[in-house]
């Protein structure tokens, strides 16, 4: 999917008054220079290419960050707010169910959701040059 | 504008069935989380039901295994298939759309179930 | 998971600040909402993600969340804020939860 025609400040908006607190409750008791960050973006339709691709893909370690509630609420965000999503997501949702797995925190998921908070951060800073 | 109408409520007897549908205009519905909330005469809210654009769903545990929630996106239409009914599940059912999967930022007027012989 | 609980009734004088509190275990964690229901008509949304206000509330309606509780507060209350009021919040289960409910009576 292309993101370039979301509208990006409602999905700011969303991310400050509905889904951060999620991402930090998910990192409870971790220390907050435990994880590098490792993955970047350069801009906001890349940073969410990166934030869809680390929240709904499953990885070695960690396949289950799709049922969370940061998840479900970046999910229905992206539905709202960036035209045309909800149709090209519908067929990969219906694989997805067939291979859904039971919701496990792995120190793989943390560090998962740390790169997702860094994204997300720089998501809402465009303007910030990259490191 | 912006709006929600449920219909298809009405009285049934205990056991019994019955079919709400939820009409919603002024807005993308095939984006958006849909829900149903009911609340019982004199009672409190209670979320009864959810579901996606792409046909997932959620349930309270008082009606898992007897509601069935469903949407045609192509209609903007909403449904709640209630089945087994109890007089415990009486009550006016709301629709409602549910903004980012956690506030309920619009509802419909509601529609009266009544589960009584 | 979680249980909302909210005091059945709170009074409070025309002018003068009604605090309204929803109790929940790590309540804090979450995010909170507050609905507004007058008698026979359905709800409205007076406060998302615990402090933000819906455009047409009134800037007397505010909210805060910490520990393991959330409270709405309403300064200057008027005869017109007389109605019962939800908290909500989601449980890890991914389902939404309400509270009991608060009867505000302007005295």
């Known amino acids: 999917y292309d993101f370039t025609n979301c509208d990006f400040e409602k999905i700011k908006a969303a991310y400050l008054s509905t889904i951060s607190k999620d991402l930090i409750t998910y990192m409870s008791g971790t220390k907050s220079t435990e994880f590098n960050n490792t993955v970047s973006c350069s801009n906001r339709p890349h940073c969410l290419t990166e934030i869809q691709s680390l929240t709904f893909n499953p990885t070695a370690g960690c396949a289950s960050l799709a049922k969370e509630m940061f998840a479900m609420k970046t999910k229905a965000a992206l539905a709202i707010w960036c035209p045309g999503y909800s149709e090209t997501q519908i067929n990969a949702t219906q694989a997805m169910k067939k291979r859904r797995k039971r919701k496990v925190t792995t120190n793989k998921c943390l560090e998962q959701v740390s790169q997702l908070q860094g994204l997300w951060r720089r998501f809402n800073r465009p303007l910030l040059k990259q490191q | 504008q912006v709006q929600l109408v449920e219909s298809g409520g009405g009285l049934v007897q205990p056991g019994g069935s019955l079919r709400l549908s939820c009409a919603a205009s002024?807005?993308?519905?095939?984006?958006?989380?849909m829900s149903w909330v009911r609340q019982a005469p004199g009672k409190g809210l209670e979320w009864v039901s959810g579901?996606?654009?792409?046909?997932?769903?959620y349930y309270a545990d008082s009606v898992k295994g007897r509601f069935t929630i469903s949407r045609d996106n192509s209609k903007n239409t909403l449904y709640l298939q209630m089945n087994s009914l109890r007089a415990e599940d009486t009550a006016v059912y709301y629709c409602?759309?549910?903004?980012?999967?956690?506030?309920?930022?619009?509802w419909g007027q509601g529609t009266l179930v009544t589960v009584s012989s | 998971d979680i249980e909302l609980t909210q005091p059945p009734s709170v009074s409070v004088a025309p002018g003068q600040t009604a605090r309204i509190s929803c109790g929940g275990d790590?309540?804090?964690?979450?995010?909170v909402y507050w609905y507004q229901q007058k008698p026979g008509q359905a709800p409205v949304l007076v406060i998302y993600?615990?402090?933000k206000r819906p455009s047409g509330i009134p800037e007397r309606f505010s909210g805060s969340n910490s520990g393991n509780t959330a409270t709405l507060t309403i300064s200057g209350t008027q005869a017109e804020d007389e109605a019962d009021y939800y908290c909500?919040?989601?449980?890890?289960?991914?389902?939404?939860?309400f509270g009991g409910g608060t009867k505000l009576t302007v005295l």
């Open positions: 409602a759309r549910q903004q980012y999967f956690d506030h309920i930022d619009i």
């Open positions: 002024g807005f993308t519905f095939s984006s958006y989380y």
């Open positions: 579901t996606f654009f792409d046909g997932s769903t």
């Open positions: 790590s309540l804090g964690g979450k995010y």
């Open positions: 993600g615990d402090s």
């Open positions: 909500q919040s989601y449980t890890n289960a991914l389902s939404t939860v």
